[in-house]
């Protein structure tokens, strides 16, 4: 009767960028609804996204409490209109997610070059310090606040007239590079967490070139 048409969720997948974290799963529900629970390895289960027909659940609020913890989620399946019903073993059907450690696994979002300023043969390039949803003392922390020196940026820079990309690295959000006087340069940055073996790099920032409005030139 109650659960004959209920199927367990599958392909549970964490989608996370700069700690904004969503659990996705399949299938699209037919005559059933889902509830998600999340827990740390040693903690209690907390329910989220109650009786939803969505196949995703935003768990950001939970994981930002401690991004270095390892989390496990599970998705329960219930018959639509009869959510009290349980499976044959007296439990609703559920499926576990893979474990997820936000600090080690969240994808690095695409960085943005905030500004660049040329003074003679030096250019200072500044990367925007993106705000995350991780909080401390009621304020949102930046990516740099969370990762500290674990996060570096690689700057690619090249003369507008050539194709070879020189590189520089920083564990702050600023680069100071040498350039040839009278040449226009283009810039792109990439966020990197070198200690990781997965999700080490962001996508490249949009390219910014000298002679455009973000830059400033001083003799």
């Amino acid at each position: 009767s109650g659960t004959t048409n209920t199927v367990a969720a599958y392909n549970l997948t964490w989608k996370s960028t700069n700690f904004k974290t969503i659990l996705e799963w399949e299938p699209k529900p037919v005559n059933q609804v889902y509830t998600v629970q999340i827990s740390t390895k040693s903690g209690d289960w907390k329910s989220k996204c109650f009786y939803t027909t969505d196949t995703e659940c935003d768990l950001t609020d939970e994981i930002v409490k401690d991004v270095k913890q390892t989390y496990l989620a599970r998705v329960f399946s219930y018959p639509a209109g009869n959510v009290e019903s349980t499976g044959s073993a007296g439990e609703p059907l559920y499926e576990n997610s893979p474990e997820f450690t936000p600090y080690l696994e969240t994808n690095l979002g695409q960085p943005t070059i905030q500004s660049f300023e040329q003074v003679g043969t030096k250019v200072n390039v500044t990367v925007e310090d993106e705000r995350t949803l991780v909080r401390r003392n009621n304020t949102f922390l930046s990516l740099r606040d969370v990762f500290g020196k674990d996060l570096i940026y690689t700057l690619y820079y090249w003369k507008s007239s050539s194709s070879g990309k020189k590189t520089a690295k920083t564990n702050t959000n600023e680069f100071l590079i040498d350039v040839d006087k009278g040449e226009n340069y283009c810039f792109s940055v990439q966020a990197v967490i070198p200690s990781r073996t997965v999700n080490r790099k962001s996508t490249d920032s949009p390219v910014e070139c000298m002679g455009q409005e973000k830059g400033e030139f001083r003799e």
Partner: antibody, heavy 120, light 107 residues
Framework: EVQLVESGGGLVQPGGSLRLSCAAS????????IHWVRQAPGKGLEWVGY????????YYADSVKGRLTISADTSKNTAYLQMNSLRAEDTAVYYC?????????????WGQGTLVTVSS | DIQMTQSPSSLSASVGDRVTITCRAS??????VAWYQQKPGKAPKLLIY???FLYSGVPSRFSGSRSGTDFTLTISSLQPEDFATYYC?????????FGQGTKVEIK
């Protein structure tokens, strides 16, 4: 286990071409940077160029610019060094090396090298 | 390009000796200097990174230091397996550049 294995070296005539391969295992090249370094017989190490396989960006030493081209096939987890218009002075052992792109560490893993001899 | 001037080009030493090799950068490279060891017919192996940090698995008799643009590799007590050629490298800016090498031979 992280490993880099170069292949494709051999004897080639001046003006000829050769393509070297650098097959990586134990890591994914797209999240690192791959460099080529060469060493002429009895000489020191000379940096040739790099590729960031995630975006295709490259840079070359002046001595090889326009003649040597680095590419990568992330589906094969392999980087390549295409060598054209070869000269006697290109004779060397060619190494590929992994750059973890950290602030502090340079090339942490190297291949065993492949010998290219340019001679008539 | 930044030049890395390495000295001496060769030295003779005995097992147990303290050996010092220096590299001078032609301009500021911060601490972005590495040292490699290379044995004949083999690829270079990373010993020291960031001027003074010992790479994983490298014996503690190897150490590195920095004073401005001068960088030093020290082997506190030379062992038989340490006879090899040593290279410094700056990776502060593109292109990364190597010193000319120092061959450590048995006296």
């Amino acid at each position: 286990e992280v490993q880099l294995v170069e292949s494709g070296g051999g004897l080639v005539q001046p003006g000829g071409s050769l393509r070297l391969s650098c097959a990586a295992s134990g890591f994914t090249i797209s999240i690192y940077t791959i460099h080529w370094v060469r060493q002429a017989p009895g000489k020191g190490l000379e940096w040739v160029g790099y590729i960031d396989p995630s975006n295709g960006y490259t840079y070359y030493a002046d001595s090889v610019k326009g003649r040597l081209t680095i590419s990568a096939d992330t589906s094969k987890n392999t980087a390549y060094l295409q060598m054209n218009s070869l000269r006697a002075e290109d004779t060397a052992v060619y190494y590929c090396a992994r750059d973890p792109q950290s602030i502090s560490s340079p090339f942490d893993y190297w291949g065993q090298g492949t010998l290219v001899t340019v001679s008539s | 390009d930044i030049q890395m001037t390495q000295s001496p080009s060769s030295l003779s030493a005995s097992v147990g000796d303290r050996v010092t090799i220096t590299c001078r950068a032609s301009q500021d490279v911060n601490t972005a200097v590495a040292w490699y060891q290379q044995k004949p017919g083999k690829a270079p192996k990373l010993l020291i990174y960031s001027a003074s940090f010992l790479y994983s698995g490298v014996p503690s008799r190897f150490s590195g230091s920095r004073s401005g643009t001068d960088f030093t590799l020290t082997i506190s007590s030379l062992q038989p397996e340490d006879f090899a050629t040593y290279y410094c490298q700056q990776h502060y800016t593109t292109p990364p550049t190597f010193g000319q090498g120092t061959k450590v031979e048995i006296k």
